[in-house]
């Protein structure tokens, strides 16, 4: 299915930063592995791969085509 890369943004909804208070987010975090269709506005976000939306974080991530890496699958994997 290619390489999965996570967008660095977490929108703060699940306390993506260690310095943030995550006390009120434990129930949502159980859904961290769930994905939905990417919003239409991210149609061109993933350059060499397909976009999926991390439900718990409300942020796009890319599943890269074979041979590509990077948050947006924008780089050729030299080790591929």
């Amino acid at each position: 299915d290619g390489n999965s890369t996570r967008s660095p943004e977490t929108n703060g909804l699940l306390c993506g930063d260690p310095e943030e208070n995550c006390a009120a987010t434990t129930t949502q975090s159980k859904r961290k592995g769930h994905f939905s269709r990417c919003p239409k506005q991210y149609k061109h976000y993933c350059i060499k791969g397909r976009c999926r939306f991390v439900v718990a974080e409300q942020t796009p991530s890319c599943v890269c085509d074979e041979g590509y890496i990077g948050a947006r699958c924008e780089r050729v994997d030299l080790f591929y």
């Epitope: 660095p8 943004e9 929108n11 703060g12 930063d17 310095e19 919003p39 239409k40 506005q41 947006r72």
Partner: antibody
Framework: QVQLLESGGGLVQPGGSLRLSCAAS????????ISWVRQAPGKGLEWVSY????????NYADSVKGRFTISRDNSKNTLYLQMNSLRAEDTAVYYC?????????WGQGTLVTVSS | DIQMTQSPSSLSASVGDRVTITCRAS??????LGWYQQKPGKAPKLLIY???SLQSGVPSRFSGSGSGTDFTLTISSLQPEDFATYYC????????FGQGTKVEIK
């Protein structure tokens, strides 16, 4: 705690330019998408633009496309909005907000007035 | 562009009342909808995301529901600090906000 502090607003004539800045602190700026959202006096909210964490994926509202440019400097934890060819209808409080789809932290806003 | 239409544009209510605000999208947006609260002279505050998920730190009297084109924000028992303007926002296509609903004291 998360803080976003906008600056650079002021009075400008129609056709003029202005550059807004947003200084971020309290979180790892380089990991987050950031947006500009504006609010004309007594009116509702209007999303203006966003930029992804790496500064490579950008979108604009149709109303500002071709006139405004969003950018960021992750080494300075700062977001920018270069506004050119300003019009009276661009008069608003401009907020920077954390996020691209949803906005969980907002600055206090900076007022831009376009008037002759 | 997706248009977001809120109703009512304003309402009067008393402390303890149950308040419902609706938001309709001009086309289906699945559950890509957020709700914000804004008080005069202040920045907006995120209340609800993904149509029904409560943002961290927001009181449980706020709830959201709906999918597709029709969405609802409910305040189960209005508190004095809840008098404000509420906005919905879709984030399927490029982000757009509703025109706002002002909740005033009766």
């Amino acid at each position: 705690q998360v803080q976003l502090l906008e600056s650079g607003g002021g009075l400008v004539q129609p056709g003029g330019s202005l550059r807004l800045s947003c200084a971020a602190s309290g979180f790892t700026f380089s990991r987050y998408w950031i947006s500009w959202v504006r609010q004309a006096p007594g009116k509702g909210l209007e999303w203006v633009s966003y930029i992804d964490s790496g500064g490579t994926f950008i979108n604009y509202a149709d109303s500002v496309k071709g006139r405004f440019t969003i950018s960021r400097d992750n080494s300075k934890n700062t977001l920018y909005l270069q506004m050119n060819s300003l019009r009276a209808e661009d008069t608003a409080v401009y907020y920077c907000a954390r996020g691209g789809s949803l906005f969980d932290y907002w600055g206090q806003g900076t007022l831009v007035t376009v008037s002759s | 562009d997706i248009q977001m239409t809120q109703s009512p544009s304003s309402l009067s209510a008393s402390v303890g009342d149950r308040v419902t605000i609706t938001c309709r999208a001009s086309q289906g947006i699945i559950s890509y909808l957020g709700w914000y609260q804004q008080k005069p002279g202040k920045a907006p505050k995120l209340l609800i995301y993904a149509a029904s998920s409560l943002q961290s730190g927001v009181p449980s009297r706020f709830s959201g529901s709906g999918s597709g084109t029709d969405f609802t924000l409910t305040i189960s028992s209005l508190q004095p600090e809840d008098f404000a303007t509420y906005y919905c926002q879709q984030y399927d296509a490029l982000n757009t906000f509703g025109q706002g609903t002002k909740v005033e004291i009766k």
